[in-house]
């Protein structure tokens, strides 16, 4: 390992299309990839009249937007879709919402998802 | 390095079955979901089928449902996409593609390919 | 379904060009879009994912930017090698769909 990197072996999986997408529910899903390639865990969720809503959470590829953050936070202005990555185990079991723009309250979700 | 080398193509009549064959190699097979995507000749690519790294879950286009059925063997590296009550409208380069996450974020590695003509 | 659509179909540039191609989803699809290249008579390539990310081995010169339902990938400066055809593609949900193609010939 990196001095410094956390490294990512495995991350919360979540599907709320699961059915549809014919995959688990839930779990720990193992990161692989390239030896050269860096690991992330990722959320996506979506804001449905305050009530936060997962659609996805697992590993996510090598990808610069991720580098070295420990936390899953999204900072993009109100998207549609709320996406955030992180390095580290498990560290999508949390993530969050600190718009860059605007000062706001975040919305901290250390949510499970219901099976 | 990683390989994948599709087999089985071949020209069938309609109503008829093939067989496609991919041979996995140089990564750990039954760590990654794979998928099977189809080119008509001069057309777009076509999403046909994909499984996870362990068989216990499949999904297919609407296009294919009920007559194609994918399936993997992990002691012996190979996927595999039986093909039933075959129509001109299969008629295709079928490439078998890795899904890079369990999710299938980016096809990462492709076969060549294998050509199935169906015609009369 | 999500409908992926890409402009133009085709295009004509010369060596030295800086190319554009945009892809559109019919819903937001957040992050999850990549690109292949295709060159005849051969398998698709990954060129980038997740948006932005260049997959092993693709030049600098090829880049990614967007996010929800518009996308667009980017030649800076059009070499022989680069005349193929790309495509678009969503894994939001399944099925995966791609985008029609967009072929750049030489002008």
């Known amino acids: 390992a990196i001095l410094g990197r956390s490294e990512t072996q495995e991350c919360l999986f979540f599907n709320a299309n699961w059915e549809r997408d014919r995959t688990n529910q839930t779990g720990v899903e193992p990161c692989y990839g390239d030896k050269d390639k860096r690991r992330h865990c990722f959320a996506t969720w979506k804001n449905i009249s305050g009530s936060i809503e997962i659609v996805k959470q697992g590993c996510w590829l090598d990808d610069i937007n991720c580098y070295d953050r420990t936390d899953c936070i999204e900072k993009k202005d109100s998207p549609e879709v709320y996406f955030c990555c992180c390095e580290g185990n498990m560290c999508n079991e949390k993530f969050s919402y600190f718009p860059e723009m605007e000062v706001t309250q975040p919305t901290s979700n250390p949510v499970t998802p219901k099976p | 390095e990683v390989q994948l080398l599709e087999s089985g193509g071949g020209l069938v009549q309609p109503g008829g079955s093939l067989r496609l064959s991919c041979a996995a190699s140089g990564f750990t097979f039954d760590s990654y979901s794979m998928n099977w995507v189809r080119q008509a000749p001069g057309k777009g690519l076509e999403w046909v089928s994909n499984i996870n790294y362990n068989g216990g879950y499949t999904g297919y286009a609407d296009s294919v449902k009920g007559r194609f059925t994918i399936s993997r063997d992990n002691s012996k590296n190979t996927l595999y996409l039986q093909m039933n009550s075959l129509r001109a409208e299969d008629t295709a380069v079928y490439y078998c593609a890795r899904g890079a996450n369990w999710h299938d974020t980016a096809l990462d590695y492709w076969g060549q390919g294998t050509l199935v003509t169906v015609s009369s | 379904d999500i409908q992926m659509t890409q402009s133009p179909s085709s295009l004509s540039a010369s060596v030295g060009d800086r190319v554009t191609i945009t892809c559109r989803a019919s819903q937001s699809i957040s992050r999850y879009l990549n690109w292949y290249q295709q060159k005849p008579g051969k398998a698709p390539k990954l060129l980038i994912y997740?948006?932005?990310s260049l997959a092993s081995g693709v030049p600098s010169r090829f880049s990614g930017s967007g996010s929800g339902t518009d996308f667009t990938l980017t030649i800076s400066s059009l070499q022989p090698e680069d005349f193929a055809t790309y495509y678009c593609q969503q894994s939001y949900e399944s099925p995966l769909t791609f985008g029609g193609g967009t072929k750049v010939e030489i002008k």
């Open positions: 997740a948006v932005t």
